[in-house]
Interface confidence: low
């Protein structure tokens, strides 16, 4: 249970970085991003490390930049396996990163919000039916 | 300034009810997870609950299960725990807590707290 | 549960003195630990997150290490502001869960 709630601990704090972010999104370079979204299942931990990949970055304007830099770089940092995201890894039938729609950085975090709430709730429901993924 | 401030508490008789509240301000209340932290008269603090920054994932100290609720109104930055079936040993301080965001663990803003006296 | 034993639980010492205050943890928390200090009367003020990043505003001479199940918290030079009781306090798995607390008196 308890690496369980670690990876859960992680997610949300992902979705509460996004949501940081997202204040933030006009000292965000406006380029167009991967941003995957009505993710296949099966496919959601290979659309997460899209959008981990993605090249967000702060447009270097004023006092938000450090704090930007910070939270991009904990978007970017590895959260705790479970037996689902492994399983997944194996998956050579997922898209790639490339063939996702671009889109620029407002909705590209909206995207990937809605993606980590999926994750979660998928997470939570495994959980419901007996099945441990830590 | 950054600020919680806690309302809402008082003296209720066991089994009965209350509704704390927390308004927020000095700072973009939707984007932080918020927790409620409670202290017994003397003793040490205990964890309550916790709800994220869009309320999609809420959790409960075993000993509040099924008889606390917590909530947030990010549109009128506040945060809520509705208290059922209250007992003896709900008296405490309760405080309402921000969680420190940006993938960092720790509270780093908290109310000044306000008194639930449970007591026939 | 994962449950968070500090000692000792409480402690004398003198202004300029160096304290350390430990936090063990029951099974492996990674560094998801903070430490708290509270005055009587008051909210508990956050000293450090991340069991040793420094929080903004607070003195240099507070400071954490540790990870996995063993924490401390030290006080390089007591001031006579730091008689308190400290928490820590872990977020590696839910429920959260704080210390019972170690109250730093004056000898």
């Known amino acids: 249970m308890q690496g369980q709630d670690r990876h859960m601990i992680r997610m949300r704090q992902l979705i509460d970085i996004v949501d940081q972010l997202k204040n933030y999104v006009n000292d965000l370079v406006p380029e167009f991003l991967p941003a995957p979204e009505d993710v296949e299942t099966n496919c959601e931990w290979s659309a997460f490390s899209c959008f981990q990949k993605a090249q967000l970055k702060s447009a270097n304007t004023g006092n938000n930049e450090r704090i930007i830099n910070v939270s991009i770089k904990k978007l970017k940092r590895k959260p705790p396996s479970t037996n689902a995201g492994r399983r997944q890894k194996h998956r050579l039938t997922c898209p790639s990163c490339d063939s996702y729609e671009k889109k620029p950085p407002k909705e590209f975090l909206e995207r990937f919000k809605s993606l980590l709430q999926k994750m979660i709730h998928q997470h939570l429901s495994s959980r419901t039916h007996g099945s441990e993924d830590s | 300034e950054v600020q919680l401030v806690e309302s809402g508490g008082g003296l209720v008789k066991p089994g009965g009810s209350l509704r704390l509240s927390c308004a927020a301000s000095?700072?973009?209340?939707?984007?932080?997870?918020m927790n409620w932290v409670r202290q017994a008269p003397g003793k040490g603090l205990e964890w309550v609950s916790s709800i994220t920054s869009g309320s999609y994932y809420i959790h409960y100290a075993d000993s509040v299960k099924g008889r606390f609720t917590i909530s947030r109104d990010n549109a009128k930055n506040s945060l809520y725990l509705q208290m059922n079936s209250l007992r003896a040993e709900d008296t405490a301080v309760y405080y309402c807590?921000?969680?420190?965001?940006?993938?960092?663990?720790?509270?780093?803003?908290w109310g000044q707290g306000t008194t639930v006296t449970v007591s026939s | 549960a994962i449950q968070l034993t500090q000692s000792p639980s409480s402690l004398s010492a003198s202004v300029g003195d160096r304290v350390t205050i430990t936090c063990r943890a029951s099974q492996d928390i990674e560094s998801a630990l903070a430490w708290y200090q509270q005055k009587p009367g008051k909210a508990p003020k956050i000293l450090i997150h991340d069991a040793s990043s420094l929080e903004s505003g607070v003195p240099s001479r507070f400071s954490g290490s540790g990870s996995g199940t063993d924490f401390t918290l030290t006080i390089s030079s007591l001031q006579p502001e730091d008689f308190a009781t400290y928490y820590c306090q872990q977020f590696n798995s839910y429920p959260y869960t704080f210390g019972q607390g170690t109250k730093l008196e004056i000898k």
């Open positions: 000095g700072f973009i209340f939707s984007s932080y997870s």
């Open positions: 807590v921000r969680e420190r965001g940006w993938g960092y663990y720790g509270m780093d803003v």
